[in-house]
């Protein structure tokens, strides 16, 4: 499924949400890095529109920052992409998943960090 | 101020179609959701179809689905809403509805004033 | 039949206070918001209450939302002439993946 900002028409849902998440996850990334989230939902089953929070303000996709379902690319981070994200229901603003994302200024070994 | 214009109304010959437009002024449009929704004459509200920036999805009321198409143009502040295959039970005043801010609950804050759609042999 | 279940039609007098009832289910009012929407004679819907119980700037403090498991009401107090309108609850709704309104109440002031 490729990411982008073209439309997707979306069928019947299988269930209604599921409780929200524990704890937030913690990720570094390197200047330059894409940084990528998932965030696939509770239960398994559609939950309606989601969107995409930053520091408490809705993300628009564009060139570089690039949605999909359930899934955020940002590409080319600097360090003004660090800060909170989370993937909402866009209806009620129910956190679904949460990311604490840390882009420190030297550029990705090419292995994968962990945040303490 | 927040404004909503629907163009594009009028009458129809069942089988048919017609797009509608509305042309948004006031807000930042390509940051938020919009709605169709539509009131048959002496009838309730009936949401027809939603699009989505914060994940790009789109949304089709059963009714409509597989004959109406929505779209937008950012570039134009325009949302648009092709209608193929227009039955006489399509007969309503078409609302454009905007969407509050994506990092608030949902809700049509919103509205235009309507354009009638008459679907009549 | 509208998913959203409200009585066709209200009244009351002046100073009085009217509750509108909205019924659903669990796949819509009982895990989604529940807004209000009036609906004055020959004009476009205007936004009452959303998320359940908030009012939009400009909202009289008359009009107060409230949901408890399935339904929602809408209670408007002091009654007023300028009050007579449709009215409608409206949530998402997940087994059928869009938004659903109620029937509309028709509220007439005596």
């Known amino acids: 499924e490729s990411l982008g900002t073209e439309q997707r028409v979306v069928g019947r849902a299988a269930e209604v949400p599921g409780p929200e998440p524990g704890q937030q996850e913690q990720l570094v990334f390197g200047s330059g890095d894409a940084v990528e989230l998932s965030c696939p939902p509770p239960g398994g089953g559609p939950m309606g529109p989601t969107v995409w929070v930053k520091d408490g303000t809705g993300l628009v996709p564009s060139e570089r920052v690039l949605v999909g379902p359930q899934r955020l690319q940002v590409l080319n981070a600097s360090h003004e992409d660090s800060g909170a994200y989370s993937c909402r229901q866009r209806l009620t603003q129910r956190v679904l998943c949460h990311f604490s994302v840390r882009v420190t200024d030297a550029p990705s070994s090419g292995d994968d960090e962990d945040g303490e | 101020e927040v404004q909503l214009l629907e163009s594009g109304g009028g009458l129809v010959q069942p089988g048919g179609s017609l797009r509608l437009s509305c042309a948004a002024s006031?807000?930042?449009?390509?940051?938020?959701?919009m709605s169709w929704v539509r009131q048959a004459p002496g009838k309730g509200l009936e949401w027809v179809s939603g699009i989505y920036s914060g994940d790009g999805s789109i949304y089709y009321a059963d009714s409509v689905k597989g004959r109406f198409t929505i779209s937008r143009d950012n570039s134009k502040n325009t949302l648009y809403l092709q209608m193929n295959s227009l039955r006489a039970e399509d007969t309503a005043v078409y609302y454009c509805?905007?969407?509050?801010?994506?990092?608030?609950?949902?809700?049509?804050?919103?509205w235009g004033q309507g354009t009638l759609v008459t679907v009549s042999s | 039949q509208s998913v959203l279940t409200q009585p066709p039609s209200a009244s009351g007098t002046p100073g009085q206070r009217v509750t509108i009832s909205c019924s659903g289910s669990?796949?819509?009012?009982?895990?989604?918001?529940v807004s209000w929407y009036q609906q004055l004679p020959g004009t476009a819907p205007k936004l009452l209450i959303y998320a359940d119980s908030k009012r939009p700037s400009g909202v009289p403090d008359r009009f107060s939302g409230s949901k408890s498991g399935t339904s929602a009401s809408l209670a408007i107090s002091g009654l007023r002439s300028e009050d007579e309108a449709d009215y409608y609850c409206?949530?998402?709704?997940?087994?059928?993946?869009?938004?659903?309104f109620g029937g509309g109440t028709k509220l007439t002031v005596l």
């Open positions: 409206a949530s998402w709704d997940y087994s059928l993946s869009g938004y659903v």
């Open positions: 006031g807000f930042t449009f390509s940051s938020y959701d």
């Open positions: 509805a905007k969407d509050a801010p994506t990092n608030e609950p949902s809700r049509f804050d919103y």
């Open positions: 669990s796949s819509n009012i009982g895990n989604n918001y």
